[in-house]
């Protein structure tokens, strides 16, 4: 049967971004409209047709436009994308002979983690605060030259929609951990990065 | 361009199957249509085939009885219809679109349906 | 389905006349009607396509418009080979529906 070939994409906030629909048949399309996924119905974006050319709806004047203009392959491209623009998105395909085929194209936005590390001496014990802030959220691990040491992690969610994770590693003999290496590793959409301290005493 | 099989005499409750068979261009590239004109009455569409993915689709007021397929080897089409009545006795056409333009078609075959 | 009403049913008229001929859809069918010519014993032949384009080798006296329910077909000068039914077609919504044409006789 005829079908919709589209692929999921996922970018970073703040950066354009563009979502394709190709239409596996040997007829184009009278016309093809995209529209955004809603809870309770889909809300049209913009129309490409060779009656109208493009027709971008008024919500959506500033925020995309049909950067391939085909009504066999269809791009839609945001200049600048923001946490409202995720979510999933539809093509449809308006064709002679066998009506609307559509397409469903979902758009995931990410932000890259901001890490800080610092260490902290008291008296008698010595913490280390690793903090990575991303979306969707990160996952924050410990190097350490010996094993036994206390750790604990605090999550926190942020109205922007990006997550904070805090992990204090708790080293009770701070003596022993002078001018030795602790690695913060950061992991974040399968990417794991590293981040060195050493801790020299104050 | 299209070339349709010969007129047909059939008996009520029997099937006709017409073939139009396309020359000259790409085969797939174009949807096949099938359309009828009973004597003295409007034109009526039956169905159409996209040859590229053998889709095809059909008049609900044919209630299952019609039938389209292709055999892109042979470049052919072809329109089956079942339990014949004396109402189908008509003039079936094949013809070829692109998207919406149509073009060509075939000369025509009459198909009569009598006891 | 979408039912198409044309008018007139019959017309004649004169050769060099304007001749107009109108298609009315039971519901909105955006700009896709399409307008064919049929002369007795032959296929139909297309003349327009989407309201208004004219479809290759169609002399240019022939001009369509309208859009929604409302469609006109023009003969802006009426030639004797001109003489055939003409049929609208909606392909808006399936199932794809014509009119019950129009005959056109020259006087």
């Known amino acids: 049967q005829v079908q919709v070939v589209t692929q999921d994409e996922r970018e970073q906030l703040y950066t354009p971004a563009s979502l394709k629909c190709s239409l596996q048949n040997a007829q184009e399309a009278l016309i093809v409209t995209w529209q955004k996924k809603k809870a309770v119905s889909p809300e049209n974006m913009v129309t490409f047709s060779e009656n109208h050319g493009v027709v971008i709806q008024p919500a959506y004047k500033d925020k995309i436009n049909i950067t391939q203009l085909g009504l066999q392959n269809s791009t839609i491209t945001f200049w600048n994308i923001t946490l409202e623009d995720e979510g999933c998105y539809m093509c449809l395909f308006n064709t002679f002979g066998f009506g609307k085929i559509s397409g469903t194209a979902c758009l995931t936005v990410y932000v890259q983690p901001i890490v800080s590390l610092h260490y902290k001496f008291s008296e008698d014990h010595l913490n280390i605060t690793c903090s990575a802030t991303a979306r969707p959220a990160p996952m924050v691990f410990w190097k350490v030259p010996r094993s036994g040491i206390e750790n604990s992690t605090v999550t926190l969610s942020h109205p922007n929609g990006t997550t904070s994770v805090t992990s204090i590693l708790h080293i009770k003999d701070p003596k022993n951990q002078v001018g030795k290496e602790v690695i913060c590793q950061v992991l974040h959409l399968g990417t794991v990065t590293d981040f060195k301290q050493t801790v020299n005493k104050g | 361009q299209l070339v349709q099989s010969g007129a047909e005499v059939k008996k009520p409750g029997a099937s006709v199957k017409v073939s139009c068979k396309a020359s000259g261009y790409s085969f797939t590239d174009y949807i096949i249509l099938w359309v009828r004109q009973a004597p003295g009455q409007r034109l009526e569409w039956m169905g159409h085939?996209?040859?590229?993915?053998?889709?095809?689709n059909y008049n609900l007021k044919f209630k299952g009885r019609v039938t389209i397929t292709r055999d892109t080897s042979a470049s052919t089409a072809y329109m089956e219809l079942s339990s014949l009545r004396s109402e189908d006795t008509a003039v079936y056409y094949c013809?070829?679109?692109?998207?919406?333009?149509?073009?060509?078609w075939g000369q025509g075959t009459l198909v009569t349906v009598s006891s | 389905d979408i039912q198409m009403t044309q008018s007139p049913s019959s017309l004649s008229a004169s050769v060099g006349d304007r001749v107009t001929i109108t298609c009315k859809a039971s519901q909105d069918i955006n700009s896709y009607l399409s307008w064919f010519q049929q002369k007795p014993g032959k296929a139909p032949k297309s003349l327009i396509y989407?309201?208004?384009r004219l479809v290759d080798g169609v002399p240019s006296r022939f001009s369509g418009s309208g859009s929604g329910t409302d469609f006109t077909l023009t003969i802006s000068s009426l030639q004797p080979e001109d003489m055939a039914t003409y049929y609208c077609?909606?392909?808006?919504?399936?199932?794809?529906?014509f009119g019950q044409g129009t005959k056109l006789e020259i006087k």
């Open positions: 085939i996209d040859p590229y993915y053998g889709s095809s």
């Open positions: 077609l909606q392909y808006d919504e399936f199932p794809y529906t």
């Open positions: 989407r309201a208004n």
């Open positions: 013809g070829r679109s692109k998207r919406d333009y149509f073009d060509y």
